[in-house]
Amino acid sequence: MAVTACQGLGFVVSLIGIAGIIAATCMDQWSTQDLYNNPVTAVFNYQGLWRSCVRESSGFTECRGYFTLLGLPAMLQAVRALMIVGIVLGAIGLLVSIFALKCIRIGSMEDSAKANMTLTSGIMFIVSGLCAIAGVSVFANMLVTNFWMSTANMYTGMGGMVQTVQTRYTFGAALFVGWVAGGLTLIGGVMMCIACRGLAPEETNYKAVSYHASGHSVAYKPGGFKASTGFGSNTKNKKIYDGGARTEDEVQSYPSKHDYV
């Protein structure tokens, strides 16, 4: 009973988490204009993974997609990839876990098969959650770096009194949705892995048979098979950073550097 509850809860938590990852990936508010120095702007900028938007005081909102692939920063591409991988793994995990649920009977599926499927889906949820958390964290780090870079040269003097205020971006709602969703998927995955241990048969369906010898008594009890899975991680962290060097064409072309972070 506890195993079924753990498995079911793990499935529901993962489902909510993956829905959240999908929502975060689609959201436009990954980064929003920092209003610290200008709380009463009549033009509010915010950006997502796929497009940047401007909401005007008039109520009009204009969004433009990033119609270039090669022109986008490598970090943004990496974040997109991580989120998509997270969604794909999560979706496959959900599909597998549906068939693995103890409360669902499919033909004469063995408990060992269900245990393996539960473990597989659990691992997929864990990786999916980690992908989402990593993606959101990479984007957040990119925002922090650019925030302090733009703060350093926030006001560029243009002949005395005139000032050009550079738009700074801060964390958008999508980042928090992504972190929470990734965490939920991760927790759901862990729960599925825990449930797997309870599903795996500790002993065979045959009763233990005792053989009584004349001199001494020996009981033979066939033992259950336990499978352990080990994970090896050999991820190399490579810092990809765009120092801000731009060709003349890049400076003039739309979208600008600040449209993605």
């Epitope: 204009q33 200008n38 009463v40 702007t41 009549a42 033009v43 900028n45 950006q47 940047s52 938007c53 401007v54 005007e56 005081s57 008039s58 109520g59 009009f60 204009e62 433009r64 005139v162 000032q163 050009t164 205020v165 550079q166 738009t167 739309y254 600008s256 600040h258 449209d259």
Partner: antibody
């Protein structure tokens, strides 16, 4: 045809109060952000206050903050400006204006204005 | 607050003449998010409310004659009337539409010579 008609202007004593109204017609009032702009006797234009379509956000000129309140009744298609603690520098012709949806926050339609004179 | 400075404050012109009115803002009115400049130009004739001519620094409002042209970027903007007509004699105001308070320039009065 878009029409904005202001009313409520009067001669008031310093410290007095007044409520201006602006009746709108010819467009879906609730969709548009509305503003009050005043023109001083020296013919200078001065933005006073803005209220967004749903009424959730309001913006004010610093010198009128706490004294003026912009509000709207979308059911009656009417914009209001409640003014208290009036000063002599509030003497002006008050215009009600509509912020165009696709006009980059520019005021695309204006009323004929209502005059306020603050004098003892 | 963003200060809008207009020049000249008044201008005497002959009919058919080309006129250039300038407007300078103390801060950039350019928005990087959509690559637009948030500046408007208005025309006010005696006894009438202001009328929108140009928005987004260069977009002509519908119904405005094509002799009116807006240009500029960031902090420096221009309103050009290619061939002044008698009906163009009025006061012209520029306005910051980027940041509250939405400040106006002092105006430029166009008079007949």
């Amino acid at each position: 045809e878009v029409m904005l008609v202001e009313s409520g202007g009067d001669l008031v004593k310093p410290g007095g109060s007044l409520k201006l109204s602006c009746a709108a017609s010819g467009f879906t009032f609730s969709t548009y952000t509305m503003s009050w702009v005043r023109q001083t006797p020296e013919k200078r234009l001065e933005w006073v206050a803005t209220i967004v379509g749903g009424g959730g956000y309001t913006y004010y000129l610093d010198s009128v903050k706490g004294r003026f309140t912009i509000s709207r009744d979308n059911a009656k298609n009417t914009l209001y400006l409640q003014m208290i603690s009036l000063r002599s520098e509030d003497t002006a012709l008050y215009y009600c204006a509509r912020m165009g949806l696709t006009q980059r926050n520019a005021l695309d339609y204006w009323g004929q204005g209502t005059s306020i004179t603050v004098s003892s | 607050d963003i200060v809008m400075t207009q020049s000249p404050s008044s201008l005497s012109v002959s009919e058919g003449e080309k006129v250039t009115l300038n407007c300078k803002s103390s801060q950039s009115l350019f928005n990087s998010g959509n690559q637009k400049n948030y500046l408007a130009w208005y025309q006010q004739k005696p006894g009438q409310p202001p009328k929108l001519l140009i928005y987004g620094a260069s977009t002509r409002e519908s119904g405005v004659p094509d002799r009116f042209t807006g240009s500029g970027f960031g902090t420096d903007f221009t309103l050009t009337i290619s061939s002044v007509q008698a009906e163009d004699l009025a006061v012209y105001y520029c306005q910051n539409d980027h940041t509250y308070p939405l400040t106006f320039g002092a105006g430029a009065k166009l008079e007949l010579k």
